[in-house]
Amino acid sequence: SSSPTSSASSFSSSAPFLASAVSAQPPLPDQCPALCECSEAARTVKCVNRNLTEVPTDLPAYVRNLFLTGNQLAVLPAGAFARRPPLAELAALNLSGSRLDEVRAGAFEHLPSLRQLDLSHNPLADLSPFAFSGSNASVSAPSPLVELILNHIVPPEDERQNRSFEGMVVAALLAGRALQGLRRLELASNHFLYLPRDVLAQLPSLRHLDLSNNSLVSLTYVSFRNLTHLESLHLEDNALKVLHNGTLAELQGLPHIRVFLDNNPWVCDCHMADMVTWLKETEVVQGKDRLTCAYPEKMRNRVLLELNSADLDCDPILPPSLQTS
């Protein structure tokens, strides 16, 4: 796995009472910021659960893995990690659970080696379209990001500023085509109702996509065709009713794909016939024997793989003149 190891040895801890004295001087190259733990051997800095309100300015130049989790950062401004000399080796940055509600344009600029970014569990009411691309150019310099973890970043309903949350996130993913090299994207638990149709086509390097625990009802307008390298697609715990022929064919055409579909409210009527036929033949779906019907009531808990065409009927729609009030 490519995740940074957090089991760093020989951590040195910086005493809080030194903070004011140290910050008044030019930062020493290998000092450890107040309220953080540092291991030069593991190239790791941990500033965890310290209620920090801003990113420490005196991060050591050697840092490769930076954990800033469980803080109260609120806002990540442009150049939040820009330093002289730059943090040239920073490869993995974890900002999860730090009460971020705003990430501004260029927040991650000047991090040439940043491969993995985790912003999970922050109520991101304002994610700039240029948070990851750094500029508003139509084609930006490629971002070095390979893994982007954005699980549970949906803010409370009253903080969503009357705009589509899905749209805001997708705008940041697509700006300047900067994330063409992205290989893992996690967007679980974000109350997504839909996936904008152009998002996947512009992320051609994806190997792993996690959309689990959202509220996706349909994939009808989503194209997977260009995702040649996609290996895992997590769609568990959504609101999917049926997958239609176009989607089934596209998924079947991806050479390495494995799809996870557990815990969706499948509607087992006549529109489900193609999907059932496909499920019986495909090796794409993991745990396909666990998929069960949710509707109509008479079909509840029936296993999809055990259905045949006679089971899958639709109630006739009566012409208006025959409908009763």
Epitope: S2, R115, E147, S205, P255, H256, R258
Partner: antibody, heavy 118, light 113 residues
Framework: EVQLLESGGSLVLPGGSLRLSCAAS????????MSWVRQAPGKGLEWVSI???????YYASWAKGRFTISRDNSKNTLYMQMNSLRAEDTALYFC????????????WGQGTLVTVSS | EIVLTQSPSSLSASVGDRVTITCQSS????????LSWYQQKPGKAPKLLIY???TLASGVPSRFSGSGSGTDFTLTISSLQPEDFATYYC?????????????FGQGTKLEIK
């Protein structure tokens, strides 16, 4: 502990067949791409074959038709069936795990020796 | 057939020296970055040092570094330590319509001067 353990290497006659095994422990084989790499005595590393998570297989051009990579997820084991063996197939055969994000071999077994000789 | 050419094939150096090994690919590696470096000692399996051209593998000392893109790559050891004398291999990953292909360089043997 996460590790790979190869077995099945032996002395075999030219034209003969052999099946190598690689038992994985500490992780689920089905979640990773897995590969075979070989090294002739005193020589460098040479890629042989790779199997993707869902079972797609790819081979070095010289291995196509003679070697077959497969796996049994229930046994957490990778295999390499080698047919029509030649003297130049004599080598130490390593199995290796591929990173889930990058296309690199991040875990190696210790190898099993195949000797093809009359 | 894709070829990875390492140079030099062998070199002698002393503890404390700065050493550079180059690797040239006959085709661009996948995404211009999918090149790895491995260290192998006699009788042992290879050990991953650097992946994605420049990312240090977990537990690898920072005296090792990698650079390059596309077809030309470099492994640098900033200050040789006694345990660094070994053989080094580059490995590229390639993708085409027909699928995946992997290749290794012929190796560079680093010996004590």
């Amino acid at each position: 502990e996460v590790q790979l353990l190869e077995s099945g290497g032996s002395l075999v006659l030219p034209g003969g067949s052999l099946r190598l095994s690689c038992a994985a422990s500490g992780f689920s084989l089905s979640s990773y791409w897995m590969s075979w790499v070989r090294q002739a005595p005193g020589k460098g590393l040479e890629w042989v074959s790779i199997i993707a998570g869902r079972g797609s297989t790819y081979y070095a051009s010289w291995a196509k038709g003679r070697f077959t990579i497969s796996r049994d997820n229930s046994k957490n084991t990778l295999y390499m069936q080698m047919n029509s063996l030649r003297a130049e197939d004599t080598a130490l055969y390593f199995c290796a795990r591929v990173s889930s994000i990058y296309y690199t071999f991040n875990l190696w077994g210790q190898g099993t020796l195949v000797t093809v000789s009359s | 057939e894709i070829v990875l050419t390492q140079s030099p094939s062998s070199l002698s150096a002393s503890v404390g020296d700065r050493v550079t090994i180059t690797c040239q690919s006959s085709q661009s590696v996948y995404s211009n970055n999918e090149l790895s470096w491995y260290q192998q000692k006699p009788g042992k399996a290879p050990k991953l040092l650097i992946y994605y051209a420049s990312t240090l593998a977990s537990g690898v000392p920072s005296r090792f570094s990698g650079s390059g893109s596309g077809t030309d790559f470099t492994l640098t050891i900033s200050s040789l330590q006694p345990e660094d004398f070994a053989t080094y291999y580059c490995q590229g990953s390639y993708y085409s319509g027909s699928g995946w292909y992997y290749a290794f360089g012929q190796g560079t043997k680093l010996e004590i001067k």
